[in-house]
């Protein structure tokens, strides 16, 4: 995980030593560029990147989307509710990288990394949040559940499955990126 | 046509106050985050303050914390700068600017208005 | 903070030059921009991002660099570039600016 450096961050009215605006900015970056190298292993190992049949898949998931009533797009943008938007998102995506944990041969170590730093992240981010409305966390026993479904498809379903986290959650975190640089 | 306008500057003494206003138009004011900059006479540029867009967070420069406060109305879609304590050295043409959707990027810039803190 | 050092301070050129203007940061930054500034005008956004041409700039613009060194170039200098141009960066607040370097008239 990169190291960041503090800023000053002032949440209205109150000062704050906050968390820096730099380092969650770093943060997702570095996330992005873990998902950039999986995504790399998975389409050379298999052609799910070119594939047309996500739609049987993504029937099993359900990965987190912005949508325009989350307030992250410069249409309809609320700044607090995007702020909740994107660190439930990001809880949500938790059990979604443990899948990924154990399905890469020569990226393991990159696999772990993006995991490992999405929790420095949602750290980061709940420390910018402090002042909002409680952020509500998934149920461990509905994920626990989910993570067995997950790990129980075939290995075409697996390695599609695998591509679409890693696709949702780099458009997820990219969308997360342009509306926290206005905050 | 998108613009800035700032007003409210003037000639104050030290220790005095004033409050500056940067009016928006031509865009929707409520996505974007809003910078205030500042240039002394015949001087480089240095960056004050910014809000975000709904006015959650605000980030000031060293040389102005305490000092300053940036606020926001946006049903006006007019962003304030609020200057206490008013030094010489805070002597400057200020700007308004709006930071560009998706980056960090102070895309549009008003013409400024003159502050001249003197005795 | 981070120091942004450009140079030249000062450059004469004539029109249909290829200029370049460099700008060293005292550590590695986030995101470089560049701007352009006339005599009792606002700073005008050319370049963001380290590399991308601000919409209605025109193509001789152009920015490169990581880390802390940077570069503007202007391929084929025109009458209207003669003025003062800023580096500025963002690496959390506060956003710092270059000293200027002026563009005259040879």
């Known amino acids: 995980v990169p190291p960041g450096e503090d800023s000053k961050d002032v949440a209205a009215p109150h000062r704050q030593p906050l968390t820096s605006s730099e380092r969650i900015d770093k943060q997702i970056r570095y996330i992005l560029d873990g998902i950039s190298a999986l995504r790399k292993e998975t389409c050379n190992k298999s052609n799910m990147c070119e594939s047309s049949k996500e739609a049987l898949a993504e029937n099993n998931l359900n990965l987190p989307k912005m949508a325009e009533k989350d307030g992250c797009f410069q249409s309809g943008f609320n700044e607090e509710t995007c702020l909740v938007k994107i660190i439930t998102g990001l809880l949500e995506f938790e059990v979604y990288l443990e899948y990924l944990q154990n399905r890469f041969e020569s990226s393991e170590e990159q696999a772990r990394a993006v995991q490992m730093s999405t929790k420095v992240l949602i750290q980061f981010l709940q420390k910018k949040a402090k002042n909002l409305d409680a952020i509500t966390t998934p149920d461990p026993t509905t994920n626990a559940s989910l993570l067995t479904k997950l790990q129980a498809q075939n290995q075409w379903l697996q390695d599609m499955t695998t591509h679409l986290i890693l696709r949702s959650f780099k458009e997820f975190l990219q969308s997360s990126l342009r509306a926290l640089r206005q905050m | 046509e998108v613009q800035l306008v700032e007003s409210g500057g003037g000639l104050v003494q030290p220790g005095g106050s004033l409050r500056l206003s940067c009016a928006a138009s031509?865009?929707?004011?409520?996505?974007?985050?809003m910078s205030w900059v500042r240039q002394a006479p015949g001087k480089g540029l240095e960056w004050v303050a910014k809000?975000?867009?709904?006015?959650?967070?605000?980030y000031y420069s060293d040389t102005v914390t305490g000092r300053f406060t940036f606020s926001l109305d946006t049903s006006k879609s007019t962003a304030y700068l609020q200057m206490n304590s008013l030094r010489a050295e805070d002597t400057a043409v200020y700007y308004c600017?709006?930071?560009?959707?998706?980056?960090?990027?102070?895309?549009?810039w008003g013409q400024g208005t003159l502050v001249t803190v003197s005795s | 903070d981070i120091q942004l050092t450009q140079s030249p301070s000062s450059l004469s050129a004539s029109v249909g030059d290829r200029v370049t203007i460099t700008c060293s940061a005292s550590?590695?930054?986030?995101?470089m921009y560049w701007y352009q500034q006339k005599p009792g005008k606002a700073p005008k956004l050319l370049i963001y991002?380290?590399?991308n041409l601000a919409s209605g700039v025109p193509s001789r613009f152009s920015g490169s660099g990581s880390g802390t060194d940077f570069t503007l170039t202007i391929s084929s200098l025109q009458p209207e570039d003669f003025a003062t141009y800023y580096c500025?960066?963002?690496?959390?607040?506060?956003?710092?600016f270059g000293q200027g370097t002026k563009v005259e008239i040879k």
């Open positions: 500025m960066q963002w690496s959390g607040y506060p956003y710092t």
């Open positions: 991002d380290m590399s």
């Open positions: 550590i590695s930054v986030s995101y």
């Open positions: 809000i975000s867009p709904g006015g959650s967070w605000t």
């Open positions: 600017a709006r930071q560009l959707w998706g980056s960090y990027a102070l895309d549009i």
């Open positions: 031509g865009f929707t004011f409520s996505p974007f985050a």
